[in-house]
Interface confidence: low
Protein backbone atom coordinates (compact mmCIF):
# COMPACT_ATOMS: atom_id res chain seq x y z
CA UNK A 1 0.00 0.00 0.00
CA UNK A 2 1.10 3.38 -0.79
CA UNK A 3 1.64 6.50 1.97
CA UNK A 4 -0.83 9.10 1.67
CA UNK A 5 0.55 12.76 1.14
CA UNK A 6 -1.05 15.10 3.93
CA UNK A 7 -0.42 18.57 4.56
CA UNK A 8 -0.38 20.12 7.82
CA UNK A 9 -1.50 23.78 8.01
CA UNK A 10 -0.32 26.51 10.46
CA UNK A 11 -0.19 30.41 11.06
CA UNK A 12 2.48 32.08 12.17
CA UNK A 13 2.79 36.18 12.90
CA UNK A 14 6.11 37.16 11.37
CA UNK A 15 7.53 40.62 12.67
CA UNK A 16 10.31 41.54 9.89
CA UNK A 17 12.71 44.73 9.71
CA UNK A 18 13.02 45.93 6.12
CA UNK A 19 16.91 45.79 5.49
CA UNK A 20 18.80 47.35 2.64
CA UNK A 21 17.26 45.40 -0.08
CA UNK A 22 13.74 45.39 1.22
CA UNK A 23 12.10 42.27 2.85
CA UNK A 24 13.92 39.93 0.81
CA UNK A 25 11.43 37.94 -0.76
CA UNK A 26 9.25 37.75 -4.14
CA UNK A 27 5.87 37.06 -4.34
CA UNK A 28 3.32 35.52 -6.84
CA UNK A 29 -0.54 35.42 -6.95
CA UNK A 30 -3.13 38.03 -6.95
CA UNK A 31 -6.63 37.97 -8.66
CA UNK A 32 -4.71 39.22 -12.25
CA UNK A 33 -2.38 35.78 -11.51
CA UNK A 34 -3.69 33.04 -9.52
CA UNK A 35 -0.61 31.17 -8.42
CA UNK A 36 -2.56 28.37 -7.25
CA UNK A 37 -5.55 27.12 -9.00
CA UNK A 38 -9.20 28.92 -7.43
CA UNK A 39 -6.82 30.73 -5.41
CA UNK A 40 -5.82 34.56 -5.99
CA UNK A 41 -3.93 34.93 -2.44
CA UNK A 42 -0.07 35.98 -2.08
CA UNK A 43 2.14 33.55 -1.92
CA UNK A 44 6.28 33.72 -1.22
CA UNK A 45 8.15 32.48 -4.46
CA UNK A 46 11.47 33.27 -3.83
CA UNK A 47 13.81 33.79 -0.55
CA UNK A 48 16.24 36.39 -1.28
CA UNK A 49 19.56 35.04 -0.05
CA UNK A 50 21.24 37.25 2.94
CA UNK A 51 17.61 39.13 3.06
CA UNK A 52 15.57 40.36 6.09
CA UNK A 53 13.22 37.16 5.33
CA UNK A 54 16.24 35.03 5.14
CA UNK A 55 18.56 35.75 8.11
CA UNK A 56 15.20 35.43 10.14
CA UNK A 57 14.66 31.87 9.04
CA UNK A 58 10.82 31.67 9.53
CA UNK A 59 9.49 32.55 6.58
CA UNK A 60 9.65 30.05 3.78
CA UNK A 61 9.12 29.67 -0.22
CA UNK A 62 5.48 28.56 -1.25
CA UNK A 63 4.14 30.63 2.09
CA UNK A 64 0.78 31.97 1.74
CA UNK A 65 0.85 35.63 3.00
CA UNK A 66 -2.67 36.03 4.59
CA UNK A 67 -1.80 39.95 6.04
CA UNK A 68 0.73 42.48 6.28
CA UNK A 69 0.42 44.99 9.25
CA UNK A 70 -2.74 43.40 9.44
CA UNK A 71 -4.47 44.47 6.29
CA UNK A 72 -5.69 41.72 4.16
CA UNK A 73 -4.14 40.29 0.84
CA UNK A 74 -7.42 38.89 0.22
CA UNK A 75 -8.80 39.82 -3.48
CA UNK A 76 -5.93 42.13 -4.48
CA UNK A 77 -4.23 42.43 -7.67
CA UNK A 78 -0.77 41.40 -8.00
CA UNK A 79 0.80 44.65 -8.36
CA UNK A 80 -1.36 45.99 -5.40
CA UNK A 81 0.00 43.44 -3.03
CA UNK A 82 3.37 44.85 -4.47
CA UNK A 83 3.00 47.97 -3.63
CA UNK A 84 1.55 47.08 -0.09
CA UNK A 85 4.44 45.36 0.50
CA UNK A 86 7.22 48.42 -0.67
CA UNK A 87 5.00 50.32 1.59
CA UNK A 88 4.79 48.56 4.34
CA UNK A 89 6.95 50.54 6.17
CA UNK A 90 10.51 49.75 8.63
CA UNK A 91 8.51 46.90 10.88
CA UNK A 92 7.10 44.73 8.98
CA UNK A 93 4.28 42.05 10.70
CA UNK A 94 3.02 39.18 8.69
CA UNK A 95 0.63 36.68 9.32
CA UNK A 96 1.82 34.01 7.58
CA UNK A 97 0.13 30.37 6.63
CA UNK A 98 2.67 27.38 6.26
CA UNK A 99 1.77 23.85 4.33
CA UNK A 100 3.97 20.88 5.35
CA UNK A 101 3.76 18.12 3.86
CA UNK A 102 3.46 15.14 5.90
CA UNK A 103 4.24 11.66 4.53
CA UNK A 104 1.41 9.64 6.18
CA UNK A 105 2.35 5.72 6.62
CA UNK A 106 -0.49 3.02 4.70
CA UNK A 107 -3.89 4.16 4.87
CA UNK A 108 -5.40 3.01 8.62
CA UNK A 109 -1.99 3.61 10.35
CA UNK A 110 -2.29 7.77 9.88
CA UNK A 111 1.32 8.88 11.27
CA UNK A 112 0.95 11.68 13.28
CA UNK A 113 2.54 15.36 11.98
CA UNK A 114 4.16 17.26 14.91
CA UNK A 115 3.56 20.97 14.30
CA UNK A 116 6.25 22.30 16.67
CA UNK A 117 8.21 21.61 13.87
CA UNK B 1 0.19 45.30 -16.99
CA UNK B 2 -0.48 49.02 -15.31
CA UNK B 3 -2.47 51.05 -18.09
CA UNK B 4 -4.10 54.31 -18.17
CA UNK B 5 -6.10 55.26 -21.06
CA UNK B 6 -7.31 58.86 -21.11
CA UNK B 7 -10.09 60.17 -23.84
CA UNK B 8 -12.63 63.08 -24.45
CA UNK B 9 -9.51 65.28 -25.36
CA UNK B 10 -11.04 67.63 -28.35
CA UNK B 11 -11.21 71.61 -29.88
CA UNK B 12 -13.69 73.71 -27.90
CA UNK B 13 -14.95 77.44 -28.01
CA UNK B 14 -13.87 79.23 -25.01
CA UNK B 15 -16.43 79.15 -22.31
CA UNK B 16 -17.47 76.14 -23.29
CA UNK B 17 -17.29 72.04 -21.69
CA UNK B 18 -15.77 68.86 -21.54
CA UNK B 19 -15.45 65.82 -20.31
CA UNK B 20 -12.45 64.03 -19.81
CA UNK B 21 -12.29 60.06 -19.03
CA UNK B 22 -9.45 57.59 -17.82
CA UNK B 23 -9.43 54.13 -18.12
CA UNK B 24 -7.78 52.15 -15.33
CA UNK B 25 -6.76 48.45 -15.53
CA UNK B 26 -4.15 46.68 -13.40
CA UNK B 27 -4.02 49.10 -10.54
CA UNK B 28 -7.09 49.65 -8.15
CA UNK B 29 -6.99 51.09 -4.61
CA UNK B 30 -5.40 54.52 -5.96
CA UNK B 31 -5.44 57.72 -5.86
CA UNK B 32 -6.08 59.16 -9.41
CA UNK B 33 -5.05 63.09 -10.12
CA UNK B 34 -4.96 65.20 -13.43
CA UNK B 35 -2.44 67.12 -14.83
CA UNK B 36 -1.32 69.06 -17.08
CA UNK B 37 1.54 70.00 -19.95
CA UNK B 38 1.03 73.28 -21.44
CA UNK B 39 3.70 73.67 -24.94
CA UNK B 40 6.67 74.74 -23.58
CA UNK B 41 5.67 74.64 -19.47
CA UNK B 42 6.49 72.08 -16.89
CA UNK B 43 3.44 69.64 -16.25
CA UNK B 44 1.47 70.98 -13.95
CA UNK B 45 -1.23 69.26 -11.23
CA UNK B 46 -5.05 70.07 -11.96
CA UNK B 47 -7.10 67.68 -9.63
CA UNK B 48 -6.97 64.87 -8.11
CA UNK B 49 -9.37 62.17 -5.92
CA UNK B 50 -9.16 59.60 -3.10
CA UNK B 51 -8.94 56.04 -3.83
CA UNK B 52 -12.58 55.50 -2.28
CA UNK B 53 -13.88 58.34 -3.87
CA UNK B 54 -14.61 60.83 -0.95
CA UNK B 55 -12.30 63.34 -1.04
CA UNK B 56 -10.99 65.92 -3.61
CA UNK B 57 -8.44 68.72 -4.39
CA UNK B 58 -8.13 70.98 -6.93
CA UNK B 59 -5.36 73.68 -8.13
CA UNK B 60 -6.67 77.15 -7.73
CA UNK B 61 -6.32 78.16 -11.22
CA UNK B 62 -9.35 75.45 -11.80
CA UNK B 63 -11.47 75.98 -8.79
CA UNK B 64 -14.97 76.06 -9.18
CA UNK B 65 -14.91 75.09 -12.94
CA UNK B 66 -13.32 71.67 -12.90
CA UNK B 67 -14.93 68.36 -11.44
CA UNK B 68 -12.95 65.52 -10.61
CA UNK B 69 -15.33 62.43 -10.23
CA UNK B 70 -14.55 58.48 -9.85
CA UNK B 71 -16.68 55.26 -11.20
CA UNK B 72 -14.71 52.40 -9.04
CA UNK B 73 -16.88 49.76 -10.37
CA UNK B 74 -16.14 50.34 -13.95
CA UNK B 75 -11.81 51.80 -13.15
CA UNK B 76 -12.99 55.16 -14.97
CA UNK B 77 -11.84 58.33 -13.30
CA UNK B 78 -13.49 61.60 -14.76
CA UNK B 79 -12.53 65.48 -15.13
CA UNK B 80 -15.51 67.72 -16.06
CA UNK B 81 -14.32 71.08 -16.93
CA UNK B 82 -16.67 73.97 -18.03
CA UNK B 83 -15.98 77.53 -18.60
CA UNK B 84 -13.15 76.35 -20.14
CA UNK B 85 -10.33 79.31 -21.24
CA UNK B 86 -7.42 79.29 -23.93
CA UNK B 87 -4.97 79.02 -20.90
CA UNK B 88 -6.33 75.73 -20.12
CA UNK B 89 -4.93 74.37 -23.56
CA UNK B 90 -2.91 71.92 -23.08
CA UNK B 91 -2.45 67.69 -22.93
CA UNK B 92 -4.24 66.31 -20.12
CA UNK B 93 -3.11 63.36 -18.80
CA UNK B 94 -4.64 60.88 -16.16
CA UNK B 95 -2.30 59.43 -13.35
CA UNK B 96 -2.39 56.51 -10.43
CA UNK B 97 -0.36 57.15 -7.11
CA UNK B 98 1.93 54.68 -6.86
CA UNK B 99 1.34 54.15 -2.59
CA UNK B 100 -1.84 51.80 -2.35
CA UNK B 101 -4.40 53.02 -0.63
CA UNK B 102 -2.85 56.26 0.64
CA UNK B 103 -4.55 58.19 3.16
CA UNK B 104 -3.57 61.39 2.26
CA UNK B 105 -4.04 62.69 -1.82
CA UNK B 106 -0.60 64.18 -2.65
CA UNK B 107 -0.83 66.59 -5.29
CA UNK B 108 3.34 66.36 -6.12
CA UNK B 109 3.80 64.64 -9.82
CA UNK B 110 6.61 62.09 -7.96
CA UNK B 111 3.97 60.55 -5.30
CA UNK B 112 2.09 59.00 -9.14
CA UNK B 113 3.87 56.11 -10.64
CA UNK B 114 1.70 55.57 -13.26
CA UNK B 115 0.52 57.54 -16.55
CA UNK B 116 -1.35 57.69 -19.55
CA UNK B 117 -0.19 58.91 -22.82
CA UNK B 118 -2.54 62.45 -22.71
CA UNK B 119 -5.45 63.52 -24.18
CA UNK B 120 -5.34 67.00 -25.99
CA UNK B 121 -6.94 69.63 -25.26
CA UNK B 122 -7.26 72.90 -27.42
CA UNK B 123 -9.35 75.74 -26.30
CA UNK B 124 -9.86 78.67 -29.17
Known amino acids: MNGRVDYLVTEEEINLTRGPSGLGFNIVGGTDQQYVSNDSGIYVSRIKENGAAALDGRLQEGDKILSVNGQDLKNLLHQDAVDLFRNAGYAVSLRVQHRLQVQNGPIGHRGEGDPSG | QVQLVESGGKLVQAGGSLRLSCAVS??????MGWFRQAPGKEREFVAA????????VYADSVKGRVTISRDNAKNTVHLEMNSLKPEDTAVYYC????????????????????WGQGTQVTVS
Open chain 2, 95 to 114: AADGRFRAGRIGTSLGLYHY
Open chain 2, 26 to 31: GVSFRN
Open chain 2, 49 to 56: ISWSGDST
